[in-house]
Amino acid sequence: MQKGDQNPQIAAHVISEASSKTTSVLQWAEKGYYTMSNNLVTLENGKQLTVKRQGLYYIYAQVTFCSNREASSQAPFIASLCLKSPGRFERILLRAANTHSSAKPCGQQSIHLGGVFELQPGASVFVNVTDPSQVSHGTGFTSFGLLKL
Amino acid sequence: MQKGDQNPQIAAHVISEASSKTTSVLQWAEKGYYTMSNNLVTLENGKQLTVKRQGLYYIYAQVTFCSNREASSQAPFIASLCLKSPGRFERILLRAANTHSSAKPCGQQSIHLGGVFELQPGASVFVNVTDPSQVSHGTGFTSFGLLKL
Amino acid sequence: MQKGDQNPQIAAHVISEASSKTTSVLQWAEKGYYTMSNNLVTLENGKQLTVKRQGLYYIYAQVTFCSNREASSQAPFIASLCLKSPGRFERILLRAANTHSSAKPCGQQSIHLGGVFELQPGASVFVNVTDPSQVSHGTGFTSFGLLKL
């Protein structure tokens, strides 16, 4: 439902996609019970949500992962919500960290990130993780979205 | 504060309720510092939030639980946010999983779920967990809500 | 972008600040990629977000901490989102609990809290933790905010 032509609702919710790429940037898709309100927010290259209008946005991500302390590096599993604005440095907006489980073969844990940020036209947000191979892609486990205030 | 008669604010926040029922669906109550903006969202049978208007909603749940690896099944504790729409499949919207703690008698952990979804008139959302007996019902620990964009 | 003079957007997102104070109330700052929409929400004494207008607000906090089971008390790490309204008792709105990790020297974990609440003019919200010395203040790890519906 639109608030009016001048002020349409802008919202997105995308679903995690397993990827053979070795990049730490998570991949997303418009599948399952996804949301893409209109073309004022788009999923670009399966990796970032890009907005056309300046304003305040509540941005969130949820990442479920399965890891084991012995099989993983000493460092914890970290998920980062990052911002790329035209002509600016990339920025970390939010991060969460969970130490690996001692459960075998691996222990599942879920991370939730969310916050209100000002985005410029053409700004993109994306999610980075320390080890994408540990991310769980079962129904509903890992997702990413935003809504314009 | 209303946005106008045509577009009133719609929001709810309900509080967990211990239940003797053996169902995996969590029970909720309008108690403590709860929110129920108007009759366009209702808590039905103490288990589901039902909306009267179609639109985009940010839906969230928080579940705190206390479990022990030895006393629990091998499977992790999973919380699921589910959707029931008239004449449709029930759907898993969001899930989070946490492996049981090795702490004794049990170790507390908290899960947060949240995302933007399109709801149809008469749609209901509810929360499922793998073991309701492990859920913590102390003040503020477990809650469930939504807001219409 | 404003909704109009009568109904301006109200939102805040503040960043954690390490503190030498022994209080359990977390300290925050308008630094880094913070949000403070206008003077209808303010950060007071670096510890609480105070609103001038009555209404429904989505309030959230994220706390990352690093703790060890042997070095910590038996009790879990608890983060609480609390409300102070003029002439009322303080209230706990939301809490999350995580048992300490067995990782050494400490294991990182992240907690996310969020919910919709009615706030009165002059109401303040703040975040309490069981042990502020365990909180992680690296970029993006610990933050606190709200948005008016």
Epitope: K31, G32, Y33, Y34, T35, H137 | F89 | -
Partner: nanobody, 123 residues
Amino acid sequence: EVQLVESGGGLVQPGGSLRLSCAASGSISSVNAMGWFRQAPGKEREFIAVIYWRDGSSLYADSVKGRFTISADNSKNTAYLQMNSLKPEDTAVYYCAAEPYGSGSSLISEYDWGQGTLVTVSS
């Protein structure tokens, strides 16, 4: 489009069991979930169970929880509904349905439907 063919219906006594099958053909790769609805005479079609093709997660209507089990055999492109402890009120035409993968929350996607199979529970 996905073609669905149900089988396994019939007459059974109260307390008995039946296993329904739903064989899918056509654009199987486009299926997100498969499940079962039922319609009793003079009543609305009601949801019974669903299974997600992706990972085997399932959900059930309260009326059948603990008695019915949904499963899938991906190699045979078939979904099953094992019905135990059947009651007279389970009497209905049972329909298999498939939901497309990229259905999205912003549109009510049309399901693909089977022709239905009759289950009668009576002594």
